[in-house]
Interface confidence: low
């Protein structure tokens, strides 16, 4: 066998180069045929009326032809024939790659609620071969489920991602990334998740600073509630009892002046938004006032009293009431 060819892979619209090489030349007629076995070139003459074929080189050892503006219909086997005795034939296969015409990402809903499972679809249109779609949530790769539809030798790939969203996902991009032999670099499209979540409630004791609550002192608690949407209502209640009459409520702040033992108990900050409700508890224990020791007449004694303050905060959450958006509690 004196005749050699190489397979060619080319991107649609670009140029394919077909080469028929002869090892031991005897000036035999060489010709190139298309997949329909029509003669493209007979030596250096082109009988085929397709001007996209151009002669790059013709010699006794090579026939080299370019095919410009390659389309998918050009795909197939091209035959080199050498009219030796006996005739020799070798073929080269042209494979045409078609990058996806369009990449679309479609998210089931613009705003999701924590714990909800949403569907995200990404469609890569009309490529050849079929596109591989990869999913990322931020930097984390996720597993999607792809369906391939073939139409006229082209493939439309739709990948479905079922995504259970958490509050940490708010503002995180969901990325659909395409891998295709005709695509160099990164072809991707993305959508940002918007996740609504019920409040997270945290109580902070802003006074006294050292955390020790004694009779006669004042107490100030601040309730911090973070959620999406931002909690519309933050309320203070006393669990299983009335709020002391001398307690002052000011927005997220609870102020109790002149503490006494009857103020002991659990104080709850409740916050809610359209997703649900949550609360945090503060257990107040009022200690005795510091004892004052009268000064001795002859001896000076310094007494240091160390008191350990127990600050207990119990946080609880519950899903939204009936009629509001329900969320799965984690």
């Amino acid at each position: 066998q004196n005749l050699f060819t190489k397979d060619v892979t080319v991107i649609e619209g670009e140029v394919a180069t077909i080469s028929c090489q002869v090892n031991k030349s005897d000036d035999s007629v060489i010709q190139l045929l298309n997949p329909n076995r029509q003669t493209i070139y007979f030596r250096d003459f082109r009988p085929l009326k397709d001007s996209r074929f151009q002669l790059l080189n013709f010699s006794s050892s090579e026939l080299k032809v370019s095919l410009t503006n390659v389309s998918i219909s050009d795909e197939g086997r091209y035959f080199c024939q050498l009219y030796t005795d006996p005739p020799q034939e070798s073929y080269t296969t042209i494979t045409v790659l078609v990058p996806p015409r369009n990449l679309m990402i479609d998210i089931q809903k613009d705003t999701a609620v924590e714990g909800e499972e949403i569907e995200v679809n990404c469609t890569a249109m009309a490529s050849k071969p079929a596109t591989t779609i990869r999913w990322f949530k931020g930097n984390t790769e996720l597993k999607g489920k792809s369906e391939v539809e073939e139409w006229s030798d082209m493939y439309t790939v739709t990948s479905q991602l079922m995504l259970k969203v958490h509050k940490e996902d708010d503002g995180v991009p969901v990325i659909c990334q395409v891998e295709h032999p005709a695509v160099t670099g990164n072809l991707q499209t993305q959508r940002y998740l918007e996740v609504q979540y019920k409040p997270q409630v945290h109580i902070q004791m802003t006074y006294p600073l050292q955390g020790l609550t004694r009779e006669g002192d004042a107490l100030e608690l601040t309730c911090e509630a973070i959620g999406k949407p931002q909690p519309v209502m933050v309320t203070w209640v006393r669990v299983d009892d009335e709020m002391p009459q001398h307690a002052v409520l000011s927005g997220p702040n609870l102020f109790i002046n002149n503490l006494n033992k009857t103020d002991n108990g659990t104080y709850r900050c409740e916050a809610s938004n359209i997703v649900g409700k949550a609360h945090s508890d503060y257990m107040l224990y009022v200690y005795d006032p510091p004892t004052t020791i009268p000064p001795p007449t002859t001896t000076t004694t310094t007494t240091t009293t160390t008191t350990t303050t127990i600050l207990t905060i119990i946080t609880d959450s519950r899903a939204g009431e009936e009629g509001s958006i329900r969320a799965v509690d984690h």
């Epitope: 649609e12 619209g13 670009e14 503006n69 390659v70 389309s71 998918i72 078609v98 015409r101 369009n102 679309m104 479609d106 469609t123 249109m125 009309a126 539809e149 139409w151 006229s152 082209m154 439309t156």
Partner: antibody
């Protein structure tokens, strides 16, 4: 200035041929797919044909397939529509449009009248 | 089917809100694009994608999509908004373009 200018329209008899041109300027022509869209008098818009940026892919509406040929010359920044075997129902204002999946740039159109 | 269906005519009082709709199977997969065409003029792209306006298009124009229906909403219609409005999309292959029949908007 970014613009498209169509030419080549006119009066032609049924069965005749006509070649429309669309000259593009102000943008990198070879980077964009292009389409032809037509509008019969008093009627709506009808997509006719499209071609990829390189010219390697062409697409046609069923109503013109086999009679019309879309092509482009990127060196001349020009889009073409070769119309053969014309019929009375091909009478329309023919627009060329830049194809980004949506048509974000249109020419003013060239009128083709097919009548005996 | 790759057809897109629009109401032939819609009217709106000056300053009021109007919604023009477009229905078709392809809109289950694709967003529609919307074009405004005034008499004797070429069409102009108004909305594309989910709800994107080309620069120069007033923000009273907005787009939305649900199921197989796309909508163009004009909030506070002006006299200059009187025109024909066309939606368009692609068939399932992505290679063929389809237009709606157009909606003639009259501002009263």
């Amino acid at each position: 200035e970014v613009q498209l200018v169509e030419s080549g329209g006119g009066l032609v008899k049924p069965g005749g041929s006509l070649r429309l041109s669309c000259a593009a300027s102000g943008f990198t022509f070879s980077s964009y797919a292009m389409s032809w869209v037509r509008q019969a008098p008093g009627k709506g818009l009808e997509w006719v044909s499209a071609i990829s940026g390189s010219g390697g892919s062409t697409y046609y509406a069923d109503s013109v397939k086999g009679r019309f040929t879309i092509s482009r010359d990127n060196s001349k920044n020009t889009l073409y529509l070769q119309m053969n075997s014309l019929r009375a129902e091909d009478t329309a204002l023919y627009y060329c449009a830049r194809d980004n999946w949506y048509f974000d740039l249109w020419g003013r159109g060239t009128l083709v009248t097919v009548s005996s | 089917s790759s057809e897109l269906t629009q109401d032939p005519a819609v009217s709106v009082a000056l300053g009021q809100t109007v919604r023009i709709t477009c229905q078709g199977d392809s809109l289950r997969s694709y967003y529609a694009s919307w074009y405004q065409q005034k008499p004797g003029q070429a069409p102009v792209l108004v909305i594309y994608g989910k709800n994107n306006r080309l620069s120069g298009i007033p923000d009273r124009f907005s787009g939305s999509s649900s199921g197989n229906t796309a909508s163009l909403t004009i909030t506070g219609a002006q006299a200059e908004d009187e025109a024909d409005y066309y939606c368009n999309s692609r068939d399932s292959s992505g290679n063929h373009v389809v237009f709606g029949g157009g909606t003639k908007l009259t501002v009263l």
